[in-house]
Each structure stands twice: as C-alpha cells, then as structure tokens.
C-alpha cells in the first residue's frame, strides 16, 4: 500500500496513528473519531494540552497513546467522554503532575507515565498509592520525580483528603420542623465542597448557605419521608475526595396495616408497620396476648435501606382450627400507638357439626340424638407478653 501522506493515518479497522512530526496541536476533527478504539500519537511537540473538548466524540476509545510529544497539562475532566478507556500511555512528555480526577471513573488496566518530569507533591499521592498497590502497571515503571528521586520515596504524611464533620441536631425533630445542618471541612489545599441531596426529593425544602470551610444546609418543613435518606457533604483537594453522609431522624407516630392471611410455606398474616422511632409490636389473639413460639412468631422481611416502614409476617407454621380467630397487631412508639385486626380461618373445626345437618348412614338408626361439645384441644393458656422491636 502507498504510504499515507496525512498527519493521521488509519491503522487496522478502528485505529489511527498520528506520527508525522509537529503536525498536530490539538485533537479536534480527527477523521472517523466516533468509531476509533485506538489512537496513537507520537512526535507532536505542539500538542501541549489535553482537555475535555479534545476527546469529545471518541466514546469508543479503548487505547490512547500520546508519547514523545509536548504534553504539559491534562485537564481533570479530559476523559469524561471516553469512559471505556482502559490503556493510557502518556510517556515521554512534559507532564509535571496529573490530577486524581483525571483517572477517576475510568477502569484503567494500564497507565504509563515514565519519562515525564514529574514533580513530587501531594497531588501525586494517588499515583504513589497505585504504585504501592500494584495498579495499572505503575510499579514496573519505577517512576522518578524530577530532581527529587523515586516517587515511591515521596513523604506523604501530610497528604490527606479533607476531613469532614457534619453537625446534626441533638434534639428530636418533628414533622414540619426546620433543621440546620453544618458541614465543617478541614484539610490542606481545599478546592471544592458541597452537598449531595439526590435522595431528598419532596422530603423538605432545601436552602444552602456558606462556603468553605463551613457549609450550611437548612431543611425546611421536613416530612417523615426524610427518615433513612442520606444527606451527604463532600469536599475535594489535590489528594482526593471525602464524603460524609448523615441521616435526620424525623419523629412520627406508629401506624400499622394488616392483610389477609396467605399460605406461603405454611401461613403468614402479612403486616406493615411504620413510625419513628421504630415501634414495639404486640400481637393479640381473640383479645388476649399472643405468646410467640417457634410455631407462631413475628418474622420481618429485609428492610429497604431508605424507608422506615417494615413489612413482615406473623408466621403460623401449623395452624389448625384452634388458631382460627381474630388477630390484632398493636404498634406503639413515644409519639402514638395504632392497631389493626383481621379475622383468620386456617382450618375447619373437625369436632364441630350442626345438629340440624343430616347424618349420612347406610341404615335407619334407632336414635339420632347427637351432641356437640367443646373442641378437645386446648392451647397453653399461660399469659406471656411479647414485645418485638422494629428497625
């Protein structure tokens, strides 16, 4: 094939090689960019910056090599549009540093940075960690900091991510209250901080105030939906990112729902209880306290992480006619109590029949008198109470 005269030439089915000296100063308008999986760039002294816009449209890119060029700066968000990037070779350029944010979110199997005049600082603590943990093929490169010795020997005692402390109210929070949260940020080289409130939805009206190092957040007119929802404070510096999540407990009274008994590997009387703090539960059977045992007991389903409501069953493993009757679930917390009742019939009473019913016989009896007495079976009648904490 004739040699390719262009700055960048196709290489394989989805690759591009740009090796003609000094032909590029940016990566805009590369031919066939949207299908590229491999991009190889060499000897481009004028290519000094790599930014977000340079790699827009290269969504399929897996391997990026920029070597023996003039690269001085790679923007923290440069690879935002190349989430599939797995090999990145930036060796023999003019890079003094590379932000942790640049590689965040990528699953890099290989990162090559040898031959750059790296400057040892806390901003490269993440790279030192990669070297320590054997990630991305970094240890094999024996990276050096320009005039400072091996990256591995860089002192890192003071290289920490920000420290966060979120203050939440000590007192009980009621529905309709306003709640002030404060996030105190400490650390060197603080860059950015903020709140993540994605879980809150309609749980409160949100007002943010203040900035580094003290961020305020007012949650106005809170609802009970705020329970179990994360409110997250975050902060970043050149070493990395820190997040702290808190939850605000909004008190509200107990509530309870009962549903018709269902046969589900033996029997289940389904219930739902809600309340903050979590209510204690008590069952009554025909108005008397139900003593829970291994054959009649409360069983909860796995709770959803972001809600206070608990679902469960009163499990009846072998109910017979003696278990037929009225089941009441009592739920109580310091803010109120609730109850719900349901009739359950598991089995007909084999000892009960109506004297009016005809008795099927094969001959005429002399006497058709019949008696109907109490059932023979008696449950243990010792009145034990049972309390089950929910939550």
């Amino acid at each position: 094939a004739a040699p390719c005269p262009d700055a960048c030439c196709p290489h394989g089915s989805s690759g591009l090689r740009c090796t003609r000296d000094g032909a590029l100063d940016s990566l805009h308008h590369l031919p066939g960019a949207e299908n590229l999986t491999e991009l190889y760039i060499e000897n481009q002294q004028h290519l000094q910056h790599l930014e977000l816009r340079d790699l827009r449209g290269l969504g399929e890119l897996r391997n990026l090599t920029i070597v023996k060029s003039g690269l001085r700066f790679v923007a923290p968000d440069a690879f935002h549009f190349t989430p599939r990037l797995s090999r990145l070779n930036l060796s023999f350029n003019a890079l003094e540093s590379l932000s942790w944010k640049t590689v965040q979110g990528l699953s890099l199997q290989e990162l090559v940075l040898s031959g750059n005049p790296l400057h040892c600082s806390c901003a490269l603590r993440w790279l030192q960690r990669w070297e320590e943990e054997g990630l991305g093929g970094v240890p094999e490169q024996k990276l050096q900091c320009h005039g400072q010795g091996p990256l591995a020997h860089m002192p890192n005692a003071s290289c920490g991510v920000p420290t966060l402390k979120v203050q939440v109210p000590n007192a009980s929070v009621d529905v309709g209250d306003d709640v002030l949260l404060r996030c105190q940020v400490e650390g060197r080289g603080l860059e950015q901080a903020g709140w993540i409130l994605t879980e809150l939805e309609q749980s409160a009206t949100v007002m943010k105030s203040g900035g580094l190092p003290s961020l305020g957040l007012t949650l106005a007119n809170v609802t009970s939906d705020l329970n179990r929802k994360n409110v997250t404070c975050w902060a970043e510096n050149d070493v990395g990112r820190a997040e702290v999540s808190v939850q605000v407990n909004v008190s509200f009274p107990a509530s309870v729902q009962l549903h018709t008994a269902v046969e589900m590997h033996h029997w289940c009387i389904p219930f739902s209880v809600d309340g903050q703090p979590a209510p204690s539960l008590r069952w009554l059977f025909n108005g008397s306290v139900l003593n829970e045992t291994s054959f009649i007991f409360t069983e909860f389903l796995e709770p959803a992480a972001n809600e206070t409501v608990r679902h469960g069953c009163l499990r009846l493993n072998q109910p017979t006619h003696v278990n037929n009757g009225n089941y009441t679930l009592l739920a109580a917390n310091p803010f109120g109590q609730a109850s719900a009742s349901i009739m359950a019939a598991f089995m007909d009473n084999p000892f009960e029949f109506n004297p009016e019913d005809p008795i099927p016989v094969s001959f005429s009896p002399v006497d058709t008198n019949s008696t109907s007495g109490d059932p023979v079976e008696k449950k243990d009648e010792t009145p034990f109470g049972v309390s089950v904490a929910v939550g």
Epitope: S294, E299, N317, T320, E377
Partner: antibody
Framework: QVQLVQSGAEVKKPGASVKVSCKSS????????MHWVRQAPGQGLEWIGE????????NYNEKFKNRATLTVDISISTAYMELSRLRSDDTAVYYC??????????WGQGTTVTVSS | EVVLTQSPATLSLSPGERATLSCSAS?????MHWYQQKPGQAPRRWIY???KLASGVPARFSGSGSGTDYTLTISSLEPEDAAVYFC?????????FGQGTRLEIK
C-alpha cells in the same frame, strides 16, 4: 452446608453449673429458632426450651424454667444453654436443633454432660 | 402439656415385612413429626407435617393420622431401618416427644 457444632463433653459436680455452646454456620443465624433438647442415658428426648436470635424471645419448658438459661451471641452465630444447680439426673447428652418453618430440621452432634460427685 | 404415647415400645420384624409404629396424643395436635435415631448419633428429622418425608428418607416410609392418633409405616423393612423412632408435637408449649419405639430387624 448447614452445621451446628457443639462444645465438648463436660464433667460437673452436683450443685455446679454448665454452659453448652452451639456454633452455627451455613445459614442466617437470626432467621431460625434454636431449640435445646436433652437425652438421659437410654432414655427419650426432653425439650428444654427455644430461643429466637432475631429478637431474643425465649420459651422454656416449665420443668427447666428456674434452672435453664438460653442466650445467643449473634456476632458469632452461637447459641448457649446454661443449666444451674446440677443434679445427678441431669447427666445426659444435650442437643441444639434449629427450626424455621419446619420442626428441628438440623441437629448438633450433642454434648455429653456428666454430673458426678 | 401434651403427652405422646408410642406403641409398641419395641418392634422386632424381619426384612421385607411391614412395620407400623403408633403415636397417640393426650389431646388433639394439628400435625405429628417423627425422628430417627441410631446409637451414638443425634436424632434426624425423618417425617414432618404428619406425612412429608425429610430429604434423603426412602419412599418406603410414610406417615399418616390426624387429631390424636398418628402412624409411621415402613412398607418393606430394610436392615438399615433399625433405629429408635420418636414422635413429636409442635403445636403447644412445651414441645413434647414420645418415649420412642425401638425397631429391631431380625
């Protein structure tokens, strides 16, 4: 697979106490009731009591109510049965067994407790 | 408490014969459960909920009954069926066991 592994044999003097452990593995400990059953030499099975690790609920056989104590440590998935004021007729093999929806589906290997002066 | 009485105390039969073990309750129970125990071993759940065979139990075993009278039947005895069989109720506290039936194979 489900395993209930009990502590080793014990020899005790009358009036002493014994604490038998039952370490569970292979299932969610808190979802099952744990029963304790004993069997004197050449005799039948006698139920001591049951405990629900999920909430600590305990039911005892009235016969053992004042002498037996059932406890659990959910952090190590272990149930315990302590029997106090031992008498010679407490000499027996003590078993733990688990149940959820069906009775005593798996048993420990048993712990021999000998009470002798 | 519900007292369970098993009969006979000992049953001695030859291989291939049919064995019938009975368990009578002092008051009505919803279901009966059976355990097999061999010397030096822990009991094993054998039949539960009156008639369900536990995992690994041969089909020659069956269970039946209701109210106060329950039966474990072995249709055709095999030598490995020699053991003590206990019935148990799980309907009221305290849980109780029968005194056991020793099945011997001649």
């Amino acid at each position: 697979q489900v395993q209930l592994v009990q502590s080793g044999a014990e020899v005790k003097k009358p009036g002493a106490s014994v604490k038998v452990s039952c370490k569970s593995s292979g299932y969610t400990f808190t979802n099952y009731w744990m029963h304790w059953v004993r069997q004197a030499p050449g005799q039948g099975l006698e139920w001591i009591g049951e405990i629900y690790p999920n909430n600590g609920r305990v039911n005892y056989n009235e016969k053992f109510k004042n002498r037996a104590t059932l406890t659990v440590d959910i952090s190590i998935s272990t149930a315990y049965m302590e029997l106090s004021r031992l008498r010679s007729d407490d000499t027996a093999v003590y078993y733990c067994a688990r149940s959820r929806y069906d009775p005593m589906e798996d048993w420990g290997q048993g712990t021999t407790v000998t009470v002798s002066s | 408490e519900v007292v369970l009485t098993q009969s006979p105390a000992t049953l001695s039969l030859s291989p291939g014969e049919r064995a019938t073990l009975s368990c009578s309750a002092s008051s009505s129970v919803g279901y009966m459960h059976w355990y097999q125990q061999k010397p030096g071993q822990a009991p094993r759940r054998w039949i539960y909920d009156t008639s369900k065979l536990a995992s690994g139990v041969p089909a020659r075993f069956s269970g039946s009954g209701s109210g106060t009278d329950y039966t474990l039947t072995i249709s055709s005895l095999e030598p490995e069926d020699a053991a003590v069989y206990f019935c148990q109720q799980w309907s009221s506290i305290p849980l109780t066991f029968g005194q056991g039936t020793r099945l011997e194979i001649k």
